[in-house]
C-alpha cells in the first residue's frame, strides 16, 4: 500500500516516546516528503465502517472500490490530524466484518499520545459520516513498539 504523507515544511523536533531511526517516508503522489531528522511515533489504528460491505474487490488494490475507499480514508486522516506533527499513514488493510480498516499512523515523536490519537479520531466521526458517507465504529488505537527503540530524549517544545 502506498504511503500517504502529510506534506509540510517544518523541521522535525526531537521529543520523547517511541523513538525509531527510520529513513524518510516516501510517496509517489506527494512532491515534498518531510525529512525525519529524529524520531517517529507509530500507532496502529483499526475501525469498522458499518455502512459498507466487504467484498473481494477490497483484496485487490487495482479495483475502483479499493482505490476510492483508500483515497477517502487517506483524505479523512489528513483532515483529522492536520499536519503539525502528522507525518502520514501506511499499510492500509481492509478486512471482512462490514469493512474493518487497519492502518498505521506516523507522527513526529513526542507530539501526541495514544489517547489523543483516539480522541481526535472519535471527535471526527460525525464529520466523516457527512463528508465521506462513512459510518465509523469500534475504534481501537495502540502504540506500535519498536524493539530497536533508542533512549527517549527530552522533547523540544512544539
Amino acid at each position: 500500500t502506498p504511503t500517504t504523507l502529510a506534506s509540510h515544511s517544518t523541521k522535525t523536533d526531537a521529543s520523547s516516546t517511541h523513538h525509531s531511526s527510520v529513513p524518510p517516508l516516501t510517496s509517489s503522489n506527494h512532491s515534498t516528503s518531510p525529512q525525519l531528522s529524529t524520531g517517529v511515533s507509530f500507532f496502529f489504528l483499526s475501525f469498522h465502517i458499518s455502512n459498507l460491505q466487504f467484498n473481494s474487490s477490497l483484496e485487490d488494490p487495482s479495483t475502483d472500490y479499493y482505490q476510492e475507499l483508500q483515497r477517502d480514508i487517506s483524505e479523512m486522516f489528513l483532515q483529522i490530524y492536520k499536519q503539525g506533527g502528522f507525518l502520514g499513514l501506511s499499510n492500509i488493510k481492509f478486512r471482512p466484518g462490514s469493512v474493518v480498516v487497519q492502518l498505521t499512523l506516523a507522527f513526529r515523536e513526542g507530539t501526541i499520545n495514544v489517547h489523543d490519537v483516539e480522541t481526535q479520531f472519535n471527535q471526527y466521526k460525525t464529520e466523516a459520516a457527512s463528508r465521506y458517507n462513512l459510518t465509523i465504529s469500534d475504534v481501537s488505537v495502540s502504540d506500535v513498539p519498536f524493539p530497536f527503540s533508542a533512549q527517549s530524549g527530552a522533547g523540544v517544545p512544539g
Epitope: 509540510h8 483529522i80 492536520k82 507530539t111 489517547h115 489523543d116
Partner: antibody, heavy 119, light 107 residues
Framework: QVQLVQSGAEVKKPGSSVKISCKTS????????MNWVRQAPGQGLEWIGQ????????NYNAKFKGRVTLTADKSTSTAYMELSSLRSEATAVYFC????????????WGQGTLVTVSS | EILLTQSPDFQSVTPKEKVTFTCRAS??????IHWYQQKPNQSPKLLIK???ESISGVPSRFSGSGSGTDFTLTINSLESEDIATYYC?????????FGQGTKLEIK
C-alpha cells in the same frame, strides 16, 4: 526561533467589538493550529477556540461560540480573534498559543493582550 | 466537559522543599494532561506534557506522574524562581480545559 507577538492593549465600550492580532514567525504558520486562551483578572485559564490557518478550519468552545470569530492571514502569518458584543465580563488578558493538533498542549504563547471593557 | 480540580489552591513553601501539586479529572483521560507554570504578568510556560514527558529547557527538578484521573506535578527542590501559579490542562476532549491553578507563596 518560534515567536508569537500580539497587538497592544485595548479599551472598549460595552456592546462594541475588538480585533486582536497574533503575528507569528519562525515556523510554517499554515501547518499548526492557533489557539486562543482567556484569563480574567486574578482568574485561571480558559480555552476559547482554535483555527488551522492552512484551510481556515475552526473549533470553538461552546461557551464563546457566536461572540468570537477566529481568522488567519497566511500572507502575513497572522492570526486574529474578534470579540463582538463586548460586556464587562470580557475584560481579560487574551493569549494566542500554538499547538500541533486540534487537541494538544501549548509550547509557544504570545505575550498576551489586555482588553478592558468599560463605559 | 472535563473538569480539572487542582489542590491545594494555595501552598506556602520554603526554598529547597519538595513540592507536590495534584490535578484530578472528572473522568478518565489516560495520560492526556499537561502542566504549565505562570508567573505574574507573564504567559504560561509548558513544563510537562502527557503527564510525565519532559520538555527541553525545563529544569530536571520538575517531574510529572499519573494516569486516568489523578495526576501529580513535583518540584524536587524548590528554588525561589519557582514561585508562580501552576496549571494542569487536558487534551483528551473538547473543550480543552484547565485546572483552576495552584498558587505558590513563600512562607
Amino acid at each position: 526561533q518560534v515567536q508569537l507577538v500580539q497587538s497592544g492593549a485595548e479599551v472598549k465600550k460595552p456592546g462594541s467589538s475588538v480585533k486582536i492580532s497574533c503575528k507569528t514567525s519562525g515556523y510554517a504558520f499554515s501547518n499548526f493550529w492557533m489557539n486562543w486562551v482567556r484569563q480574567a483578572p486574578g482568574q485561571g485559564l480558559e480555552w476559547i477556540g482554535q483555527i488551522y490557518p492552512g484551510d481556515g478550519d475552526t473549533n470553538y468552545n461552546a461557551k464563546f461560540k457566536g461572540r468570537v470569530t477566529l481568522t488567519a492571514d497566511k500572507s502575513t502569518s497572522t492570526a486574529y480573534m474578534e470579540l463582538s458584543s463586548l460586556r464587562s465580563e470580557a475584560t481579560a488578558v487574551y493569549f494566542c498559543a500554538r499547538s500541533y493538533y486540534r487537541s494538544a498542549w501549548f509550547a509557544y504563547w504570545g505575550q498576551g493582550t489586555l482588553v478592558t471593557v468599560s463605559s | 466537559e472535563i473538569l480539572l480540580t487542582q489542590s491545594p489552591d494555595f501552598q506556602s513553601v520554603t526554598p529547597k522543599e519538595k513540592v507536590t501539586f495534584t490535578c484530578r479529572a472528572s473522568q478518565s483521560i489516560g495520560t492526556s494532561i499537561h502542566w504549565y507554570q505562570q508567573k505574574p504578568n507573564q504567559s504560561p510556560k509548558l513544563l510537562i506534557k502527557y503527564a510525565s514527558e519532559s520538555i527541553s529547557g525545563v529544569p530536571s527538578r520538575f517531574s510529572g506522574s499519573g494516569s486516568g484521573t489523578d495526576f501529580t506535578l513535583t518540584i524536587n527542590s524548590l528554588e525561589s524562581e519557582d514561585i508562580a501559579t501552576y496549571y494542569c490542562q487536558q487534551s483528551n476532549n473538547w473543550p480543552l480545559t484547565f485546572g483552576q491553578g495552584t498558587k505558590l507563596e513563600i512562607k
